[in-house]
Interface confidence: low
């Protein structure tokens, strides 16, 4: 069988994964025998995942491979020293193959000390008798979230059912900040309220502004380091006033001659709301009107007395026609007919003068 090497040191640059022959770091693996079935290349059951250092807290990278006679990390093309690995090995009961797992700890200082354009990275290398397998590179980055938003939402006054766009570009950060929106301190869930939509670039759209959307809106950016709130944008949904229908025309205000009639309407259909405009135009309309003046009735002159009749009376009359009452004017007051006793003419009896007898007409 061939000789295979495994690596125990961190002092070597390693681009081909073979390392240098150095007794301090390597020892020979046992030879395989021709009768043994061929061992497969190592397969990673778990590969290291990207990690973020928050404040000064170190991160752990972890991987697991089978079959693996040895397993080590290298970071930024340099092997991590054996003493910095925590290794565990067991035999998989089903396959009978050796499973090895390993973890290392990366500190903030180690990441900060790396110079060059590339981010700090680590990868796992596992050996079996068939050769070596490399895991993917896992990048380790120092997490942060800047304090200043690149764009903050601005307050708006919008009319009912208008579309509203509130813009937000979160502060720069690693990992990239997630964005959520608050409406009066409550998280907006567009799945729950379909009138809200959050765009891929973090802007909030209110599709059709409702009165209940009058509120304070805040953009919230958060990642594993921190949570930042934008300035609050107040959205006011206003309603412009609308006129009610006109009332009926009033009666003419003049009892005689020229006057006017009026009708009114109010700005209540709807009334303006949340700073909406009051109705434009007149709330009162007037038109000229003429009412015929009333004419009070007046009497004509009395007629001449009639001749003295057989009943020893004679009479005279007058008419309410000088002028007659018109347009609701007052009727004449007083007697239409007047009679009194007489003794001349055809009268057969002499009678003393008596009081006048008044006959009233209607």
């Amino acid at each position: 069988g061939s000789h295979h090497h495994h690596h125990h040191g961190s002092d070597y640059k390693d681009d081909d994964d073979k390392g240098s022959q150095d007794d301090e770091f390597f020892h020979e693996l046992p030879e395989t025998f021709p009768s043994d079935p061929p061992e497969p290349l190592p397969h990673f059951l778990i590969e290291p995942e990207e990690a973020y250092i928050v404040k000064n807290k170190p991160v752990n990278l972890y991987c697991k491979a089978s079959p693996a006679t040895q397993i080590y990390f290298k970071c930024n093309s340099e092997w991590v020293h054996q003493k910095d690995h925590v290794v565990d090995e067991r035999v998989d009961e089903t396959s009978g193959l050796i499973v090895r797992e390993v973890s290392i700890e990366i500190s903030r200082q180690q990441v900060e000390e790396l110079f060059g354009p590339e981010d700090y990275w680590c990868q796992c290398v596992a050996w079996s008798s068939a050769g070596t397998t490399k895991s993917r590179k896992a990048y380790v980055r120092i997490a942060y979230l800047r304090k200043t938003f690149e764009q903050e939402p601005l307050g708006k006054e919008v009319s009912l059912e208008q579309e509203v766009l509130l813009q937000c570009r979160p502060p720069e950060g690693i990992p990239v900040a997630e964005v959520e929106w608050l409406k009066n301190e409550d998280i907006i869930d567009p799945a729950e309220d379909r009138n809200f939509y959050i765009t891929i670039d973090h802007n909030l759209i209110i599709k059709q502004a409702r009165l209940s959307d009058t509120a304070n809106y805040t953009c919230v950016a958060k990642n594993i380091v921190a949570k930042r709130k934008s300035t609050t944008a107040t959205v006011i949904v206003y309603v412009n006033g609308g006129w009610s229908t006109w009332t009926e025309w009033s009666v003419c205000n003049s009892r005689c001659g020229r006057g006017y009639q009026k009708r009114t309407r109010t700005c209540t259909n709807p009334a303006p709301l949340n700073g909406g405009a009051f109705c434009e135009g007149q709330s009162v309309q007037k038109i000229a009107c003429t009412t015929l003046c009333p004419v009070d009735g007046r009497w004509t002159s009395w007629s001449k007395w009639s001749t003295c009749g057989t009943e020893c009376t004679h009479w005279r009359r007058r008419e309410c026609t000088a002028p007659a009452p018109k347009n609701g004017g007052k009727d004449c007051d007083g007697l239409v007919l007047q009679s009194k006793n007489c003794t001349d003419g055809l009268c057969m009896q002499a009678a003393p003068d008596s009081d006048d007898v008044a006959l009233y007409g209607s």
């Epitope: 009912l160 409702r210 009165l211 709807p270």
Partner: antibody, heavy 119, light 107 residues
Framework: QVQLQESGPGLVKPSETLSLTCTVS????????WSWIRQPPGKGLEWIGY???????NYNPSLKSRVTISVDTSKNHFSLKLSSVTAADTAVYYC?????????????WGQGTLVTVSS | DIQMTQSPSSLSASVGDRVTITCRAS??????LNWYQQKPGKAPKLLIY???SLQSGVPSRFSGSGSGTDFTLTISSLQPEDFATYYC?????????FGGGTKVEIK
Amino acid sequence: QVQLQESGPGLVKPSETLSLTCTVSGGSISSYFWSWIRQPPGKGLEWIGYIHNSGTTNYNPSLKSRVTISVDTSKNHFSLKLSSVTAADTAVYYCARGRGMATLPFDYWGQGTLVTVSS
Amino acid sequence: DIQMTQSPSSLSASVGDRVTITCRASQSISSYLNWYQQKPGKAPKLLIYAASSLQSGVPSRFSGSGSGTDFTLTISSLQPEDFATYYCQQSYSTPLTFGGGTKVEIK
């Protein structure tokens, strides 16, 4: 003529949930904003919140964490739930109709129902 | 929240008197103010909306005026049935808020 009628228990134990229903008769529950307003004994009026038949709600921030108003247009009624009540929630609870647009005046009111919070 | 302050908190008047109640908002509310009358054991009744519009069925002796922060409810000639508590309410923004009330009593 539109009429509103509150119904629900008159006595609720502290820490429990107060539940009231307002039944609207003589008119549709659509197109208005239906509010709950309360008045502690001998005190002034406090607006609790409103709901539109579309489900849009707006609650008084001082009560928001405890209030839920819901509407059932098929039954022409709307409901109030106020959780974790204390003696300070003892009041006459009114339901009212907000005419026209959301916060316009309350032109129809229920007669009110007294809810006492006591163990 | 917009605070509504009513004054006086109570007043005594006689039938036939002219009565004026004022309401002040903590910020400008344009004309979004409503007035209600409440009698003991009864629900409030809308009198005036949008500061000066008389609600249908309310006697014309009630009138409202004002804009911005200062508002007035006037009863031109107090009638026996007008003895009650009167509340103003702003409808400019939520939460909707009421004044503390003005009790009109018989002198």
